[in-house]
């Protein structure tokens, strides 16, 4: 599941890794963009072992899912929600 | 040190059972998915199976699945491998490994083997 | 299940050369790719993880590149003690994977 927010008062990341993530390890990922108090987009992966990674953004493994993403809601309707889940 | 020692290995004839084990010191087994694989004699590596560390996730090698079933006691810091309806084609070296969820996310170690030989 | 083309099945390198070997996967693994080597009569040793990443103590000779369904694995110097069999493995998902192995001899 992939889930977007909106609303950051400040950066959570401190320390980001470009390492690839098998999904069957992945519970959810988190995508902040940049604003509300962080100059800077983050992308907080929570694994299924209950820890917490930050990816950096430019990382190829997460680019590439990003753009697959992508591909995927451009051919669906968008949810206007505030909160985006994305299975 | 990390110390992965596989045994339970030995000679069976075909139709028969086995069970490997696999005893893991100097790492935190309870936290790790871990992995069975196996080499037959002059071949290449074949993923077997893979447990995650509740048990609760349990993937196989789709033409193994039916005979062999993956386990673990983590109070016991052991991983199984309980293999049924052998046949001479699984004959193989089987090695546990560890599944590294954390950092790498590969098989970072690696027991020495136990060899399995099928045979009438 | 994803298949791992590896290529050349063997090669012979002088020391000091540098040696290359490909990895095709049938579908796309991301950068969810590493490569093992394996010395005769021993368990196999992780070398690269994530297509690039160099695992802790691995020379700096050896390196991994790729994505998508291409990958490469390098040498750039061969030294004796690599005399061994190559491995690439694709572990995006399951069931894992491995290439049929690169045997590698000194001339």
């Known amino acids: 599941v992939l889930e977007v927010y909106y609303t950051h008062l400040r950066c959570r990341c401190v320390q980001e890794s470009s390492v690839f993530i098998p999904r069957r390890f992945i519970d959810r990922i988190q995508i902040s963009p940049r604003g509300n108090g962080c100059p800077r987009k983050e992308i907080i992966v929570w694994k299924k072992n209950k820890s917490v990674v930050c990816v950096d953004p430019q990382a190829e493994w997460i680019q590439r899912i990003m753009e697959m993403l992508r591909k995927k809601s451009s051919s669906t309707p968008p949810v206007p929600v505030f909160k985006r889940k994305i299975p | 040190e990390v110390q992965l020692v596989e045994s339970g290995g030995g000679l069976v004839q075909p139709g028969g059972s086995l069970r490997l084990s696999c005893a893991a010191s100097?790492?935190?087994?309870?936290?790790?998915?871990m992995s069975w694989v196996r080499q037959a004699p002059g071949k290449g590596l074949e993923w077997v199976a893979e447990i995650n560390p509740e048990s609760s996730t349990i993937n196989y090698a789709p033409s193994l699945k039916d005979r062999f079933t993956i386990s673990r006691d983590n109070a016991k810091n052991s991983l199984y491998l309980q293999m049924n309806s052998l046949r001479a084609e699984d004959t193989a070296v089987y090695y546990c490994?560890?599944?590294?969820?954390?950092?790498?996310?590969?098989?970072?170690?690696w027991g020495q083997g136990t060899t399995v030989t099928v045979s009438s | 299940d994803i298949q791992m083309t590896q290529s050349p099945s063997s090669l012979s390198a002088s020391v000091g050369d540098r040696v290359t070997i490909t990895c095709k996967a049938s579908?796309?693994?991301?950068?969810?790719v590493a490569w093992y080597q394996q010395k005769p009569g021993k368990a196999p040793k992780l070398l690269i993880y994530s297509a690039s990443y160099r695992y802790t103590g691995v020379p700096s000779r050896f390196s991994g590149s790729g994505s998508g369904t291409d990958f490469t694995f390098t040498i750039s110097s061969v030294q004796p003690e690599d005399i061994a069999t190559y491995y690439c493995?694709?572990?995006?998902?399951?069931?894992?994977?491995f290439g049929g192995g690169t045997k590698l001899e000194i001339k």
């Open positions: 493995q694709q572990y995006y998902s399951t069931p894992l994977t």
């Open positions: 490994a560890r599944q590294d969820d954390y950092e790498y996310y590969a098989m970072d170690y």
């Open positions: 579908q796309d693994v991301n950068t969810g």
């Open positions: 100097g790492i935190d087994f309870s936290r790790y998915w």
